[in-house]
């Protein structure tokens, strides 16, 4: 088992909104949970966008999940990761 490296980034989406993206890379096996939470509550599927889990060329995998949020509310959102019995949460950088 190889644990993922998780990285959260932000980018401007439209006035007053930003897109936050949570990327996981370098993990094995492929099955990983990656999802956004607001105030600790899971966001619905229809408010998140997922990338496919893809091989990264090193025998490991990568994927991502993104969602659009209001600027200034970043502290309310966390990215949750579960992989091979381990879990972690990752805040949005300010």
């Amino acid at each position: 088992t190889v644990p993922p490296m998780v990285n959260v980034t932000r980018s401007e989406a439209s006035e007053g909104n930003i897109t936050v993206t949570c990327r996981a890379s370098g993990f094995y096996p492929w099955n990983i949970t990656l999802s956004w939470r607001q105030d600790g509550v899971s966001l619905s599927h229809d408010t998140q966008q997922w990338g496919d889990v893809l091989p990264d060329g090193n025998g490991t995998y990568q994927t991502w999940v993104a969602t659009r949020i209001c600027q200034g509310e970043e502290q309310r959102f966390t990215c949750y990761m579960e992989h091979s019995g381990n879990h972690s949460t990752h805040p949005v950088p300010s």
Epitope: N31, I32, T33, L34, S35, R37, G40, S42, S44, H45, D46, W50, G51, D52, V53, T63, V65, Y80, E82, H83, S84, G85, N86, H87, S88, T89
Partner: antibody, heavy 120, light 107 residues
Framework: QVQLKESGPGLVAPSQSLSITCTVS????????VNWVRQPPGKGLEWLGM???????DYNSALKSRLSISKDNSKSQIFLKMNSLQTDDTARYYC??????????????WGAGTTVTVSS | DIQMTQTTSSLSASLGDRVTISCSAS??????LNWYQQKPDGTVKLLIY???SLHSGVPSRFSGSGSGTDYSLTISNLEPEDIATYYC?????????FGGGTKVEIK
């Protein structure tokens, strides 16, 4: 192999609380979500809520005020507690492991269920 | 909450028949749909996830399709062990919600 088994009181008096335990084997609770689903007699399935690997919970908002889900990772057990039971809470209660892989989000293994009757 | 409707509550078919079970959502669910089988003894099993992906160990006679608000489960060649109630379930929005079920019986 992956297994889940529910155990409950069978009979609960109206206005009392319900406690059900789901004991799992074949996987770790620290890296898997577990859901609770119920089915009243002759009716369909209703999702109650779930607990994630880190202990975070999500609830059906219609029942959130009466529900509590917790777990003991070391004993591989998940607990459902529901308060203020009424006769329409009579149902078979299931626990089910969740699989959450990007666009794919499903309950891949279910327990056999435990029947709870609310009656005086 | 999203309402899931299975208009046919029960159907009778002969062994070997092709059986199609329909499910509609009260709004678009972007293929976020699963199918479960519940045997008469209450045992529940996952059949299909994400509209059309066959769960491991499920016979290939089961298939799923659909988009938007309308989805279906097909059993291509009905076997005796397929006697059960089938439920669709959406996960586009929380809470996940199930259809009312379609009971399949042998003629």
């Amino acid at each position: 192999q992956v297994q889940l088994k529910e155990s409950g009181p069978g009979l609960v008096a109206p206005s009392q609380s319900l406690s059900i335990t789901c004991t799992v084997s074949g996987f770790s609770l620290t890296g898997s979500g577990v859901n609770w689903v119920r089915q009243p007699p002759g009716k369909g399935l209703e999702w109650l809520g779930m607990i994630w690997g880190d202990g975070n919970t999500d609830y059906n908002s219609a029942l959130k005020s009466r529900l509590s889900i917790s777990k003991d990772n070391s004993k591989s057990q998940i607990f459902l507690k529901m308060n203020s039971l009424q006769t329409d809470d009579t149902a078979r209660y299931y626990c089910a492991r969740g699989a959450y892989y990007g666009k794919r989000w499903y309950f891949d293994v279910w327990g056999a269920g435990t029947t709870v009757t609310v009656s005086s | 909450d999203i309402q899931m409707t299975q208009t046919t509550s029960s159907l009778s078919a002969s062994l070997g028949d092709r059986v199609t079970i329909s499910c509609s959502a009260s709004q678009g669910i972007s293929n976020y749909l699963n199918w479960y089988q519940q045997k008469p003894d209450g045992t529940v099993k996952l059949l299909i996830y994400y509209t059309s992906s066959l769960h491991s160990g499920v016979p290939s006679r089961f298939s799923g399709s659909g988009s938007g608000t309308d989805y279906s489960l097909t059993i291509s060649n009905l076997e005796p062990e397929d006697i059960a109630t089938y439920y669709c379930q959406q996960y586009s929005k929380l809470p996940p919600t199930f259809g009312g079920g379609t009971k399949v019986e042998i003629k």
